[in-house]
Structure formats: structure tokens, C-alpha cells
């Protein structure tokens, strides 16, 4: 089939894909590469786990879900038009050709252009309040998009909510591991 | 094109055992795992298991632990399912499902068949 | 296991209508929704996953939205050959487990 997840340019992209672990905490290793889903591995990887934590990723990629659980869909922030294709979802299951391949197509559109009377919405369209509750993602609500009742105190609030929402997700995803990118 | 070619429907006696067919077409067999859904008559959608084609591993639904036994012919591109001590609760029609490329859910589903337990 | 509840077992509606069925997962299972559309006598067919994506060739009357624990599928607006049961299924957590489905009656 040729199902699409859609993002808009300078948006989040969010792509789903989800595994049973076998106990709490008993996690299998998952790698997220650009290109579809080779024989092994992945091609091009953007972000991998092992059976503790998030061990490698790249900028502008990471897991907002919840991975010990099984959540292991991918973030892409801030995506432009090159960010268009088709991604890999590996879940390397133990065992020989066990493994579960996801190939999730992603198509970026230019972003909407609309009139921006205000310095305000100029603001709130540069930066749309990004939704942080863990793990959900789905296309409708990746953004609130602009918010017109901003006023100019909100600003720096918006801003450090944004920037902390960030830093919360580095530091849960990074454990003992080295930031790429 | 993705088919799932189920075989016919099925009379059977309390306490016996069934096997049924789904055979696969248009997709590499080897590349995705085959499930079974049980629909008993007027009720919802249980899921069974799943059987790996590959290998022949399996992945079931407790609730079926002894009741069903999931097999599969690689050189027939085709998945059996093998009910035993079969009572009148097993009767349903039972649908192989194959998951799409991009998820977890079922794109495609075979036409089901029926069993019916009765003495 | 995860239970999938739909509390509506029937629905009444006239074509043209929009109509909304629920369904609650009784854990957070994310995004890791689909539901299904089955006509008497047939198998049933993907309509929305992830759980706002429309599948491929579904009417874009059909849509879908939630994540968590709420989930809502909605026909904006509905016309004959919806007449069919709609089933909500989790894929966060083996066993895959499905609601009990909303039957759409046309009045």
C-alpha cells in the first residue's frame, strides 16, 4: 500500500511504529534509518536503540514516546522538503529472521502561507506551541499552530516552554550516551 | 495484488479437531507474518496469533493457548491453523490477516471460514 | 490485556447525518489505533489508522482522531452503503485486542 504521513515544512513529522516488549523493561533493539527496510539492519540510520536506552540518534531525530513500553515512533523536528520518503522501522527481534520491518512513507508539503498582520502572529507562526504530552503524536494535533491571544508577556514563556520541552526529552532519551549531531 | 485465499467452510463434532487453510498470494510470504482473528456469530473481533513464515514462530493470544496450533508450508505460500477439543464456543468464522507495509494493522483480510461444532 | 471499549453498541442515524462512535483503551496506548468498517457478510476493511490517516482510497467523509486513552471516528456525513459495524483495534501491546463494535443503523 502506499499510505503517506504528511508534515508541513518547519513542522514536527511523526511516524508511528510501536512493539510488545517482552517484559517491562526487557526491550529489543530498534533501529530508524532513511530508505526503505534492506535485508538487515538499516540504511542511512537516523536513530537507534539497544536493550537499555536510546544509544545513537542524530540531530532533529528522537523518541518523544515512551520506548520502554514499546513506543518507539520517530520525531522528526523542524522537517524541510529533503526530509521526504521513505523511513525504515526495524525491530530486531532475537532469533533468526525474526525481525519486524516497517517502511512508513513521509511526504513534506511547503508550508502554508498565510497574511501575518501582527508582530504577534509573526511570532507564533515562527514558533507553533508544540504538543509535549509523551508518546502522543498523532497528524491532527502535532501543532496548535498559531496562537492569536499570545501577548507580548507570553513570549519569552512560550519560548522557554519550548526550549525546556526539548531539553526534558535530551536528557530522558540520553542516559550515559553521546549526543550526535 | 495481495490475496488471502481461505479454505471452505467446516461441519465438525464436539470434541473433535479442524485445520484450516490460507493460502497467500501477490507478496512475498516469507516477509510478513500471518494472523488469525476469530468472529464468533453477532460478536467482535479476537485476535488469535501470529505465526512467522520464515522460521515458524509464533507469537499467541493466551486466551487460545492449547486450542489453536499455527503452522505454516513454506513451498505453498500458505498458513494452516489447527483447532482441537473443539466445542460449541469455537463455532465462528475465522479470517487470516496480513498487516500493511507501514503498521500494525490488518490492510488485508482473507474471506473467513466457517466452522460450525455441532453433534 | 488491553481492553478496547465501545459504549455504543448501536447507533441510529439518517444519511446526510454526521455521526461519532468512541472508543477507550484502558491504558495510554498512544497512537497505536485503527478502525475497521464491516458489511454483512464480509470481511472487514482498514479505514483510518495511527489513528487520523485515512487508508488508501477510504472517502475522506471518514476520519479519525484521539490518542492516550480516547479515541473518535466520526463520518461527517453518512450515506447508504455505510450501513456496517465499526470496530476500534489497539496495536500497542500484544495480544492486539479489538472493541465490540458500534453497528451503524440507517433510519
Known amino acids: 500500500s502506499e499510505v503517506e504521513y504528511r508534515a508541513e515544512v518547519g513542522q514536527n513529522a511523526y511516524l508511528p511504529c510501536f512493539y510488545t516488549p517482552a517484559a517491562p523493561g526487557n526491550l529489543v533493539p530498534v533501529c530508524w534509518g532513511k530508505g526503505a527496510c534492506p535485508v538487515f539492519e538499516c540504511g542511512n540510520v537516523v536513530l537507534r536503540t539497544d536493550e537499555r536506552d536510546v544509544n545513537y540518534w542524530t540531530s532533529r531525530y528522537w523518541l518523544n514516546g515512551d520506548f520502554r513500553k514499546g513506543d518507539v515512533s520517530l520525531t522528526i523536528e523542524n522537517v524541510t522538503l529533503a526530509d521526504s520518503g521513505i523511513y525504515c522501522c526495524r525491530i530486531q527481534i532475537p532469533g533468526i529472521m525474526n525481525d519486524e520491518k516497517f517502511n512508513l512513507k513521509l511526504v513534506i508539503k511547503p508550508a502554508k502561507v498565510t497574511p501575518a498582520p501582527t508582530r504577534q502572529r509573526d511570532f507564533t507562526a515562527a514558533f507553533p506551541r508544540m504538543l509535549t504530552t509523551r508518546g502522543h503524536g498523532p497528524a491532527e494535533t502535532q501543532t496548535l499552530g498559531s496562537l492569536p491571544d499570545i501577548n507580548l508577556t507570553q513570549i519569552s514563556t512560550l519560548a522557554n516552554e519550548l526550549r525546556d520541552s526539548r531539553l526534558a526529552n535530551d536528557l530522558r532519551d540520553s542516559g550515559a550516551t553521546i549526543r550526535i549531531g | 495484488e495481495v490475496q488471502l485465499q481461505q479454505s471452505g467452510p467446516e461441519l465438525v463434532k464436539p470434541g473433535a479437531s479442524v485445520k484450516m487453510s490460507c493460502k497467500a498470494s501477490?507478496?512475498?510470504?516469507?516477509?510478513?507474518?500471518m494472523n488469525w482473528v476469530k468472529q464468533s456469530h453477532g460478536k467482535s473481533l479476537e485476535w488469535i496469533g501470529r505465526?512467522?513464515?520464515?522460521?515458524?514462530?509464533?507469537n499467541n493470544n493466551q486466551n487460545f493457548k492449547g486450542k489453536a496450533t499455527l503452522t505454516v508450508d513454506k513451498s505453498l505460500n500458505t498458513a494452516y491453523m489447527q483447532l482441537n477439543s473443539l466445542t460449541s464456543e469455537d463455532s465462528a468464522v475465522y479470517y487470516c490477516?496480513?498487516?500493511?507495509?507501514?503498521?500494525?494493522?490488518?490492510?488485508?483480510w482473507g474471506q473467513g471460514t466457517l466452522v460450525t461444532v455441532s453433534a | 490485556d488491553i481492553v478496547m471499549t465501545q459504549s455504543h453498541k448501536f447507533m441510529s442515524t439518517s444519511v446526510g447525518d454526521r455521526v461519532s462512535i468512541t472508543c477507550k483503551a484502558s491504558q495510554d496506548v498512544s497512537t497505536a489505533v485503527v478502525w475497521y468498517q464491516q458489511k454483512p457478510g464480509q470481511s472487514p476493511k482498514i479505514l483510518i489508522f495511527s489513528p487520523s490517516y485515512r487508508y488508501t482510497g477510504v472517502p475522506d467523509r471518514f476520519t479519525g482522531s484521539g490518542s492516550g486513552t480516547e479515541f473518535t471516528f466520526t463520518i461527517s456525513s453518512v450515506q447508504a452503503e455505510d450501513l456496517a459495524v465499526y470496530y476500534c483495534?489497539?496495536?500497542?501491546?500484544?495480544?492486539?485486542?479489538f472493541g465490540g463494535g458500534t453497528k451503524l443503523e440507517i433510519r
Open positions: 483495534q489497539q496495536h500497542y501491546n500484544i495480544p492486539w485486542t
Open positions: 490477516a496480513r498487516r500493511d507495509s507501514s503498521g500494525y494493522w490488518f490492510a488485508y
Open positions: 501477490g507478496y512475498t510470504f516469507t516477509d510478513y507474518y
Open positions: 505465526v512467522n513464515p520464515s522460521n515458524g514462530g509464533t
